[in-house]
């Protein structure tokens, strides 16, 4: 990657981070009456998430994420869940590249939507701070 492509990658990661934080803030909103129900849904967590290729694991969980977000009141988000997830999907596909043979491996234990989002927020923050 060139310095310009790395800069683009950094910007895409920042967009991804903001989108994930927006979702987390939306579902954690004290006015969200569906939060208890949303927390019953389980998400697969990556066995490891340190590099861009590990975004394969996030991509595979975007559909379930959209389904859970559809439960939330739409006023908690600036965009409809479908559009929000579509935006994230575009970023993820660009970031992880076209290494189609890379298969995700998942951790043994599943997680709530809050734990899932926090994991990918931590991932985004760490890549932003270490990508050179």
């Amino acid at each position: 990657p060139t310095s310009s492509s790395t800069k683009k990658t950094q910007l895409q990661l920042e967009h991804l981070l903001l989108d994930l934080q927006m979702i987390l803030n939306g579902i954690n909103n004290y006015k969200n009456p569906k939060l208890t129900r949303m927390l019953t849904f389980k998400f697969y967590m990556p066995k490891k998430a340190t590099e861009l290729k590990h975004l394969q694991c996030l991509e595979e969980e975007l559909k379930p994420l959209e389904e859970v977000l559809n439960l939330a009141q739409s006023k908690n988000f600036h965009l409809r869940p479908r559009d929000l997830i579509s935006n994230i999907n575009v970023i993820v596909l660009e970031l992880k590249g076209s290494e189609t043979t890379f298969m995700c491996e998942y951790a043994d234990e599943t997680a709530t939507i809050v734990e899932f989002l926090n994991r990918w927020i931590t991932f985004s923050q760490s890549i932003i701070s270490t990508l050179t």
């Epitope: 990657p1 790395t6 990658t9 967590m45 066995k47 490891k48 998430a49 340190t50 590099e51 861009l52 290729k53 590249g97 290494e99 890379f102 491996e105 951790a107 931590t122 991932f123 923050q125 760490s126 890549i127 701070s129 270490t130 990508l131 050179t132």
Partner: antibody, heavy 117, light 107 residues
Framework: EVQLVESGGGLVQPGGSLRLSCAAS????????LAWVRQAPGKGLEWVAA???????YSPDTVRGRFTISRDNAKNSLYLQMNSLRAEDTAVYYC???????????WGQGTTVTVSS | DIQMTQSPSSLSASVGDRVTITCKAS??????VGWYQQKPGQSPKALIY???FRYSGVPDRFTGSGSGTDFSLTISNVKSEDLAEYFC?????????FGGGTKLEIK
């Protein structure tokens, strides 16, 4: 059998440069993330840099802007270009393979870098 | 960055003893923890991954456990060849960080 063999270490003056190499064999080099980890005399281990299979590079604040990790998949080789060296960069530098889903599973024997005037 | 606090920094054991080394992460790292053995004058060797899984060829005397923030490596029936320094490492996020190490001395 997986093998990682480092070379290029030596004595260099503060402010100087050095390029370390790591020759890999026994695995599909291009599919793995590779890392450099260092160990100062009598001290613990410190992660210095990593480069993934797409050649994206990662490093901590301590070396960013001074050290550059790179790879040549055709030669099954990993490199660490070290510039603006300081006394605190004195250490044994290890090349390690980062398994896709687990820890640093194979390590080289190390090469010693001494920064001193 | 995630800090890995390892204790004790050194310990002494007799052949046949059972010893435990602990590592505490400054934040949740799931089970993304590895343990390494470094014998005098040698490079580190991977012992344990995912907190509790032994690498191929590692004797079953070495047992890793823990999740979240608290981890341990237990060596049962210590042998003279276990004389080494042991390090924990988190690979939950970059930058990877290591514990300060534990030197195991054989009496």
């Amino acid at each position: 059998e997986v093998q990682l063999v480092e070379s290029g270490g030596g004595l260099v003056q503060p402010g100087g440069s050095l390029r370390l190499s790591c020759a890999a064999s026994g695995f599909t080099f291009s599919s793995y993330t590779l890392a450099w980890v260092r160990q100062a005399p009598g001290k613990g281990l410190e992660w210095v840099a990593a480069i993934d299979s797409s050649s994206y590079t990662y490093s901590p604040d301590t070396v960013r802007g001074r050290f550059t990790i790179s790879r040549d998949n055709a030669k099954n080789s990993l490199y660490l270009q070290m510039n603006s060296l300081r006394a605190e960069d004195t250490a044994v530098y290890y090349c390690a393979r980062d398994s896709n889903w687990d820890a640093l599973d194979y390590w080289g024997q190390g090469t010693t870098v001494t920064v001193s005037s | 960055d995630i800090q890995m606090t390892q204790s004790p920094s050194s310990l002494s054991a007799s052949v046949g003893d059972r010893v435990t080394i602990t590592c505490k992460a400054s934040q949740n790292v799931g089970t993304n923890v590895g343990w390494y053995q470094q014998k005098p004058g040698q490079s580190p060797k991977a012992l344990i991954y995912s907190a509790s899984f032994r690498y191929s060829g590692v004797p079953d005397r070495f047992t890793g456990s823990g999740s979240g923030t608290d981890f341990s490596l237990t060596i049962s029936n210590v042998k003279s060849e276990d004389l080494a320094e042991y390090f924990c490492q988190q690979y939950y996020t970059y930058p990877y960080t290591f514990g300060g190490g534990t030197k195991l001395e054989i009496k």
